[in-house]
């Protein structure tokens, strides 16, 4: 059983975690007191692994061209994606780009635009797809 402590001065929940105070579990960070951990504040900070941090990592705010795919929890950062009608290639740091409105002449659309990729077009007589 964990021993819950309450630090009145800052109003954060603390609990005794390990006798040596080396690591705190995901969703928490080290307190100023060795052996105690402070819970991250939902929507404000997170830690996704056991850690020796003195503060939770700040939640990311989605950019103006993005929307929230999943909110920040105490153990997971905010997940953002491009707004409908726009995309950004996986692992790219660029801004979201407008999806193509249609395929070039002689090509047909085989995949709709997603937040991670533009529409996909193929030649009418071919089965090989490629992005434009």
């Amino acid at each position: 059983a964990t021993i819950k402590l309450h630090d009145q001065s800052i109003g954060t929940q603390q609990w005794e975690h390990s006798p040596l105070g080396e690591l705190c579990p995901p969703g928490s960070h080290r307190s100023e007191r060795p052996g105690a951990c402070n819970r991250c504040t939902e929507g404000v900070g997170y830690t996704n692994a056991s850690n020796n941090l003195f503060a939770c990592l700040p939640c990311t705010a989605c950019k103006s061209d993005e929307e929230e795919r999943s909110p920040c929890t105490t153990t997971r950062n905010t997940a953002c994606q491009c707004k409908p009608g726009t995309f950004r290639n996986d692992n790219s740091a660029e801004m979201c780009r407008k999806c193509s409105t249609g395929c070039p002449r002689g090509m047909v659309k085989v995949k709709d635009c997603t937040p991670w990729s533009d529409i996909e077009c193929v030649h009418k007589e071919s089965g090989n797809g490629h992005n434009i």
Partner: antibody, heavy 118, light 111 residues
Framework: EVQLVQSGAEVKKPGASVKVSCKIS????????IHWLRQAPGEGLEWMGW????????DSPQKFHGRVAMTRDTSISTAYMELTRLASDDTAIYYC???????????WGQGTLVTVSS | QSALTQPASMSGSPGQSITISCTGT?????????VSWYQQHPGKAPKLMIY???NRPSGVSNRFSASKSGNTASLTISGLQAEDEADYYC??????????FGGGTKVTVLG
């Protein structure tokens, strides 16, 4: 009232080592993390690292790695900071401080002047 | 060179107000509400004046107040008094699990 009392001034030659002590009274020695900071003459404050008085583990910025050692003797409620391979730019007042809530330092020791001169 | 940027000196007459700025980055001041301010009189150890951006420890005069906007924190001393003449340092916790300080601001009370 919690008090941090540090050892006296030291004069060292370049290449030597210095060990500064910090005795805590008025509260449990192991209740809070201890930090070491320094201030060169006429300069600002520089954080040197944290020390866990329960486990004896410590961490410091890259610039001090391999040169600073933080230890303790819990029987006399005292923390130590040893700095090796001293150079003239290590001349500074060295402070110990306790970690207060919200990642601040309070209270502080009175400081220990370490002068490195040939 | 200090990680946080403060003006080297500021001055004011008794009764006036002065505001000291402290500029960092999104990895320190802007990323965390863990900005502190310390007062240091000559030959003395630093004294905590403000913690967690805006909070005053008990015993610190309410003439000292602080705030933060983006990557810049500010300390305001209102009704300046002779005993306020000192060096003031800002500090912030950082995303590297370390602490950084400003270079300090020397406050002079005129007259």
């Amino acid at each position: 009232e919690v008090q941090l009392v540090q050892s006296g001034a030291e004069v060292k030659k370049p290449g030597a080592s210095v060990k500064v002590s910090c005795k805590i009274s008025g509260d449990s020695f192991t209740a809070y993390f201890i930090h070491w900071l320094r201030q060169a003459p006429g300069e600002g404050l520089e954080w040197m690292g944290w020390f866990n008085p329960i486990s004896g583990t410590a961490d410091s910025p890259q610039k001090f790695h391999g040169r600073v050692a933080m230890t303790r003797d819990t029987s006399i409620s005292t923390a130590y900071m040893e700095l090796t391979r001293l150079a003239s730019d290590d001349t500074a007042i060295y402070y110990c401080a306790r970690q207060h809530h919200s990642n601040t330092f309070d209270p502080w020791g009175q400081g220990t002047l370490v002068t490195v001169s040939s | 060179q200090s990680a946080l940027t403060q003006p080297a000196s500021m001055s004011g007459s008794p009764g006036q107000s002065i505001t000291i700025s402290c500029t960092g980055t999104s990895s320190d001041v802007g990323g965390y509400n863990y900005v502190s301010w310390y007062q240091q009189h000559p030959g003395k150890a630093p004294k905590l004046m403000i913690y967690a951006v805006t909070n005053r420890p008990s015993g610190v005069s309410n003439r000292f107040s602080a705030s933060k906007s983006g990557n810049t924190a500010s300390l305001t001393i209102s009704g300046l008094q002779a005993e306020d003449e000192a060096d003031y340092y800002c500090s912030s916790y950082t995303s590297s699990n370390t602490w950084v300080f400003g270079g300090g601001t020397k406050v002079t009370v005129l007259g």
